[in-house]
C-alpha cells in the first residue's frame, strides 16, 4: 500500500486496539458542489428499465435513511412504451460503508459496516437464451 | 427523529464537541453474505448502456479505492448491436459516505465526507427533444 507520512499534529490514541478504533468527526463535508442534482433525479422514470425508490430506515445505522431501488418491470420498455420480455431490467448494486451503533443504542460509538444497496436499474440481454 | 434509549454500557466521550466526534471501530462487519458478486459483475458488459470501470485511488480517504463507471457510448445499444443515438446512456450516481483523514496524513483521525460516485449506466429517453 501507499505509506502516508504521519502528521505530528495528529491526535494521540488512548485506545489499546489502535488503529482499529479511530476518532471520526460527524460534521459532514459535502464534496458534491459541482453537480446539478435536478439533472439526474428523473432517470428512474425516463429509463428503459425504470425503477421505484423505497425508503429503508434504521435508527441504529448512520445514515439512518437509505433509498433502495426496485426495478418496475421484469423486462425493459421498448420504443412503443411496452414491456419487452426479451430483455431484463436488473438492479445495479453497490457496496457502501455505513456506521452501525455498537454497542446498540450508543450515540457516540460505532462500527463500520458494509452493506449492498440497489442504486438503480439497467436493461441487459438475458444470460440464458431458450432454444426452441 | 427517533429517540434511542441510551445503553448504560456505552463508552464515555471525553470530547468537548460530543456528539460531533465519535469512536468508530474499523473492523468492518460485512452484511453481504447472502449475495453472489459474480451475478451482477457482468451487467456492465450485457447492458444496453454498457460501461467501463475506472479506478479512483486516494490514500487520504477510506476506502482508498473507489470504482467509477463511465458509459461506453453516447447512445444505447439496439437489437442489432449498433449504437442508437435516439437514446442516451447516462451514469446512475449515488451519494456515499467515506472517511477523510483529518488532519491530513493522520492514521487514527477522520472526518465523514459525502461524495458522489457513478455506479453504472442506464438507457434513458432524451430530456430535450429537437423539433424539426
Amino acid at each position: 500500500g501507499i505509506t502516508i507520512p504521519r502528521n505530528p499534529g495528529c491526535p494521540n490514541s488512548e485506545d489499546k486496539n489502535f488503529p482499529r478504533t479511530v476518532m471520526v468527526n460527524l460534521n459532514i463535508h459535502n464534496r458534491n458542489t459541482n453537480t446539478n442534482p435536478k439533472r439526474s433525479s428523473d432517470y428512474y422514470n425516463r429509463s428503459t428499465s425504470p425503477w421505484n425508490l423505497h425508503r429503508n430506515e434504521d435508527p441504529e445505522r448512520y445514515p439512518s435513511v437509505i433509498w433502495e431501488a426496485k426495478c418496475r418491470h421484469l423486462g425493459c420498455i421498448n420504443a412503443d412504451g411496452n414491456v419487452d420480455y426479451h430483455m431484463n431490467s436488473v438492479p445495479i448494486q453497490q457496496e457502501i460503508l455505513v456506521l452501525r451503533r455498537e454497542p446498540p443504542h450508543c450515540p457516540n460509538s460505532f462500527r463500520l459496516e458494509k452493506i449492498l444497496v440497489s442504486v438503480g436499474c439497467t436493461c441487459v440481454t438475458p444470460i440464458v437464451h431458450h432454444v426452441a | 427523529g427517533i429517540t434511542i434509549p441510551r445503553n448504560p454500557g456505552c463508552p464515555n466521550s471525553e470530547d468537548k464537541n460530543f456528539p460531533r466526534t465519535v469512536m468508530v471501530n474499523l473492523n468492518i462487519h460485512n452484511r453481504n453474505t447472502n449475495t453472489n458478486p459474480k451475478r451482477s459483475s457482468d451487467y456492465y458488459n450485457r447492458s444496453t448502456s454498457p460501461w467501463n470501470l475506472h479506478r479512483n485511488e486516494d490514500p487520504e480517504r477510506y476506502p482508498s479505492v473507489i470504482w467509477e463507471a463511465k458509459c461506453r457510448h453516447l447512445g444505447c445499444i439496439n437489437a442489432d448491436g449498433n449504437v442508437d443515438y435516439h437514446m442516451n446512456s447516462v451514469p446512475i450516481q449515488q451519494e456515499i459516505l467515506v472517511l477523510r483523514r483529518e488532519p491530513p496524513h493522520c492514521p487514527n483521525s477522520f472526518r465523514l465526507e459525502k461524495i458522489l460516485v457513478s455506479v453504472g449506466c442506464t438507457c434513458v429517453t432524451p430530456i430535450v427533444h429537437h423539433v424539426a
Partner: nanobody, 124 residues
Amino acid sequence: EVRLVESGGGLVQPGGSLRLSCAASGFTLDYYGIGWFRQAPGKEREGVSCISSSDGSTYYADSVKGRFTISRDNAKNTVYLQMNSLKPEDTAVYYCAVAEIYLSGYGCYVDGSWGQGTQVTVSS
C-alpha cells in the same frame, strides 16, 4: 418548440480556424450543461468538449486540448466552439447536445437529443 441548431461549419485548410455556434430556442441554456460532439465517417460519435451547468467547468478530449475552446453566452442562449490549428483528422459532422461532465472529469455524456449537425472539412 424546443431546438438546438448548430452552425459555422465549412471547408478549411489545415492550420485554419472555425467557430461553431449552438443556438437554443424553446429553453434556456444556462440551466443545462452543453457539449460538442463529432462523428467522422465510419466512426462512433465522440465527445469533443463540454461545459458544466453548475460551475462552468469544462472538459476537452485529449485530441483537441490547447486547440479548441468552448464558451457560452447565456444572454444570447448560445454555446460556441472555437477551433484553431485544425487538422485533417478533425474532419467530421459536429453536433451540440445537452450534456454533462462525468464526476471524474474524464469525458461527458449526453442527456438530450441531437440536431442535424454541421459539417467541418479540413483539407488542402
